[in-house]
Amino acid sequence: FERTRSLQDPCSNCPAGTFCDNNRNQICSPCPPNSFSSAGGQRTCDICRQCKGVFRTRKECSSTSNAECDCTPGFHCLGAGCSMCEQDCKQGQELTKKGCKDCCFGTFNDQKRGICRPWTNCSLDGKSVLVNGTKERDVVCGPSPADLSPGASSVTPPAPAREPGHSPQ
């Protein structure tokens, strides 16, 4: 099948980095400067992406692969293939319509992007707050309050078996 196809279509022999040049009797010609073809058998080469403005070049364009961009310091990538750059905020902030704003009390953001998230509610897991949360850091949950009562050992012994219907004293 491959041999048949190549007999029928001489362009299928053109490797990546070249194109099948109809103007030159379907000879495989190298991609011109600032263009590439990532697969064989292509009739045109694609224009290389240019990393301009807030974008900077992460990987140069070659004859067989497109350039890759990332964002200038103070910005981060958005979208597939870093199609956009969005400004960073400081830790403890989130990006709102009005720019970077501090996290509200009870929320935190430990990154330069994304939104402020609520502190962990330790009591939902029956634990106590060991280290308070800040705008930049979540709370640290510690042992349950009962485990911290005077005389309690660091290892909680198994609870004694109780008869059904009896409430704990």
Partner: nanobody, 123 residues
Amino acid sequence: EVQLVESGGGLVQPGGSLRLSCGASGFTFSSYWMLWFRQAPGEGLEWVANINQDGSEKYYVDSVEGRLTISRDNAKNALYLQMNSLRAEDTAIYYCARGGEGYSDSHHGTDVWGQGTTVTVSS
């Protein structure tokens, strides 16, 4: 080719005014959020203001609120920044940038930038 070209910068005394313009070409200007950024000498890029597709939503960094006004004229493919009551700390290169095409919550993503125009506020 998608292009943004800023103009209107210059030297102005404190308390003075300037109007920056940004001409857009190569894309459907009215479909995109547009933004102004600035970069003061030795500093990083700072977002200044943005405006939605029809000009009904405008947002500003706190330090310029009430002094700078962003606007657009979709018929002329133009973005503007009216700068009043200028201060020394407004000295910077001002860039216009193309934002997102949708009406999503991310109003600060950009992909195309102009070359910038310099504003110097000094007596």
